[in-house]
């Protein structure tokens, strides 16, 4: 069965500043991955980022740097100030559309005890299966 | 499919200046990164330079000081401004696009032939 998997990291040198990184774990080949926070997109999420392997990516701020790290993962660094600006309760998610397995979603946010700098282990999400 | 246009190329003397553009069909996303390539006659093609969508960029030794990549306000836009030209950078110019940055998908314009001569 396909997993997704979300970490969620604040940098230490800038507070405002987050990486959010999802890999997908299955053998499909994907197609596209869209990013959002607030919540899963298309329920009341907002995107932050899409990703086509093909085509290219688009991103919307706070987003600063959406990229490939792998054919099956990838980073986003957000950064913003006032009301930009994540906050440490901010749920990030991931969903990837992949080909056989179907669309896959994950959501994750910072670990409540991390200090600036710190990250859980990206271990898989609560798996939300989009169709 | 991404479509790449290159135009500017031409013949120009030592010394002089030319500058290349290349337009991308893509619109809507970014392309992770573009770059520019060249190949002389005889010539296996090689990297010029590169910059990334946030504006990294990448040149080669042999143009450093030269030449400048940059990408313009349209979405996509490419530009190779090069100056002091030599000889030996006769070739063609090419536009190259992989839109994700891991050579998953990889797109090339047809080319536009430079000549430095006198």
């Known amino acids: 069965t396909p997993e997704v998997w979300v970490q969620v990291r604040m940098e230490a040198t800038e507070l405002s500043s987050f990486t959010i990184r999802c890999g997908f774990l299955g053998s499909g080949s994907i197609s596209l991955v869209t990013v959002s926070w607030g919540g899963p997109n298309g329920a009341g999420g907002t995107t932050l980022a899409v990703l086509h392997p093909e085509r290219g990516i688009r991103q919307w701020a706070p987003a600063r740097q959406a990229r490939w790290e792998t054919q099956s993962s990838i980073s986003l660094i957000l950064e913003g100030s006032g009301a930009s600006s994540p906050c440490a309760n901010t749920t990030f998610c991931c969903k990837f559309a992949s080909f056989p397995e179907g669309s896959w979603e994950a959501c994750g946010s910072l670990p409540p005890s991390s200090d600036p700098g710190l990250s859980a282990p990206p271990t898989p999400a609560p798996i939300l299966r989009a169709d | 499919e991404v479509q790449l246009v290159e135009s500017g190329g031409g013949l120009v003397q030592p010394g002089g200046s030319l500058r290349l553009s290349c337009a991308a069909s893509e619109t809507y996303f970014d392309l992770y990164v573009m770059g520019w390539y060249r190949q002389a006659p005889g010539k296996d093609r090689e990297l010029v330079a590169t910059?990334?969508?946030?504006?990294?960029?990448k040149i080669v030794d042999s143009v450093k000081g030269r030449f400048t990549i940059s990408r313009g306000d349209a979405k996509n836009s490419l530009y190779l401004q090069m100056n002091s030209l030599r000889a030996e950078d006769t070739a063609v110019y090419y536009c190259?696009?992989?839109?994700?940055?891991?050579?998953?998908?990889?797109?090339w314009g047809q080319g536009t032939m430079v000549t430095v001569s006198s």
């Open positions: 910059i990334t969508y946030t504006g990294s960029i």
């Open positions: 190259n696009a992989d839109p994700s940055g891991l050579g998953r998908k990889v797109y």
